[in-house]
Interface confidence: low
Amino acid sequence: EEELQVIQPDKSVLVAAGETATLRCTATSLIPVGPIQWFRGAGPGRELIYNQKEGHFPRVTTVSDLTKRNNMDFSIRIGNITPADAGTYYCVKFRKGSPDDVEFKSGAGTELSVRAKPSAPVVSGPAARATPQHTVSFTCESHGFSPRDITLKWFKNGNELSDFQTNVDPVGESVSYSIHSTAKVVLTREDVHSQVICEVAHVTLQGDPLRGTANLSETIRVPPTLEVTQQPVRAENQVNVTCQVRKFYPQRLQLTWLENGNVSRTETASTVTENKDGTYNWMSWLLVNVSAHRDDVKLTCQVEHDGQPAVSKSHDLKVSAHPKEQGSNTAAENTGSNERNIY
């Protein structure tokens, strides 16, 4: 009679995480008498998956009734597959022996590959806000996928980015993998409404990639531009001076008026107007009683935006002559330069 052969007809089986894997195995003879065992791996360190004779294997069920005398089907099902179950499984026939059964013949092995979906990508930006023209880094992470092959892309407002570096870990073998990518983005003044998107494509996602997003509104700081303007005279001895604070983001802003270096009033931006690009404008005014001053008055509008060092604009009022015309200070921001000859 021909010697028993252990047949594992499937060289490989591909299963999605959470599903049940069927590992097929048949013997060609009932002789010799002895049990079947299933192992993952071969040689030292192999793991026992199922023992027909004894043991408790809660995730394993047999396809047929192994207690029947003429049974030659030793296929098993493994439930709730995870990436940790991947590997090569061997169906091994043992010959009844005393005191121990002796390994008689092994099947050729079935390679179980597990497909596990990546987790939703998480995008995180820099810890501190940055201003336009600066380059900031965003990171994207996704975990738990298998197999290792994965594609990651970055977009800003639908335009694909090219300046990024991606690593898949670990570099060696693992039950599942993680991807980590860092993209560099140059900020512009129009980026308050912009979004950065990390897109992950994997064989388990069937062409429907996962996306993670970050709003640049949480990253950008657009510093204000200041303009100090003298308004028409309200009364003979009163001058109305306004400070226009334009194109700033975020809204957190405190403004202080100084008369000849002394604090006159401090206020916090509240009723701001929003521009189309998401930045804000705000205006503050100061009524100056000219008759209370014997000398020229230096008015300074000082703005502290989002906890940054204050920027200021100054405006000189000459009190030695009567007002003749309206003027404005449009000197460059942060220079503290003064425009004279207003009166």
């Epitope: 791996g41 040689g43 360190g45 590997g87 090569t88 390679e111 670990p170 570099v171 060696g172 073998e173």
Partner: antibody, heavy 122, light 107 residues
Framework: EVQLVQSGAEVVKPGASVKLSCKAS????????MHWVKQAPGQGLEWIGA????????TYNQKFKGKATLTVDKSASTAYMELSSLRSEDTAVYYC???????????????WGQGTLVTVSS | DIQMTQSPSSLSASVGDRVTITCRAS??????LNWLQQKPGKAIKRLIY???SLDSGVPSRFSGSRSGTDFTLTISSLQPEDFATYYC?????????FGGGTKLEIK
Amino acid sequence: EVQLVQSGAEVVKPGASVKLSCKASGSTFTSYWMHWVKQAPGQGLEWIGAIYPVNSDTTYNQKFKGKATLTVDKSASTAYMELSSLRSEDTAVYYCTRSFYYSLDAAWFVYWGQGTLVTVSS
Amino acid sequence: DIQMTQSPSSLSASVGDRVTITCRASQDIGSRLNWLQQKPGKAIKRLIYATSSLDSGVPSRFSGSRSGTDFTLTISSLQPEDFATYYCLQYASSPFTFGGGTKLEIK
């Protein structure tokens, strides 16, 4: 039983290249990563890199990038390592060793080849 | 790269002695450490994986343990066949790195 059988000793001239082989038997070859390790005379062990036969994915120790190139012939269940621009400091025994790709622990660096001595001499 | 500092580099002992070899990792590697045995003219053999799990066929006189980033291989009672060179190997992070080796010689 799983066996890794490596090619025989090589004597090569400085500047030349050499290609070593490691044939796996006794188990499904593609289920594993094949690693290569260097041992210079009287020295310890250094990991060179590894290749995953399923898709020929490779990973290298930065120190050996440009020196070692790993390839595989799945049909022959054989992994290869080519060493280029050989110098006297490349004289060593080179081992192949295998890991299961699925296990975090039990399967790392279980099986080892007998080693191939490469002597670089003019 | 993770450095593995192994000590001692050589050790003389007698049959029946209890011997310990230590490896210190330069950073956390969890339990991902193997102990290997090398004898002249023979293939390298793995004795212990995952810090303390004994490979099949390895005598129970071999054991492994860990305290933080310090790892220890202990041979409870040296046998003649144990005289060899022993290496630790971390496989937590690529590039995988070995200790410098401990040559165990007969006193």
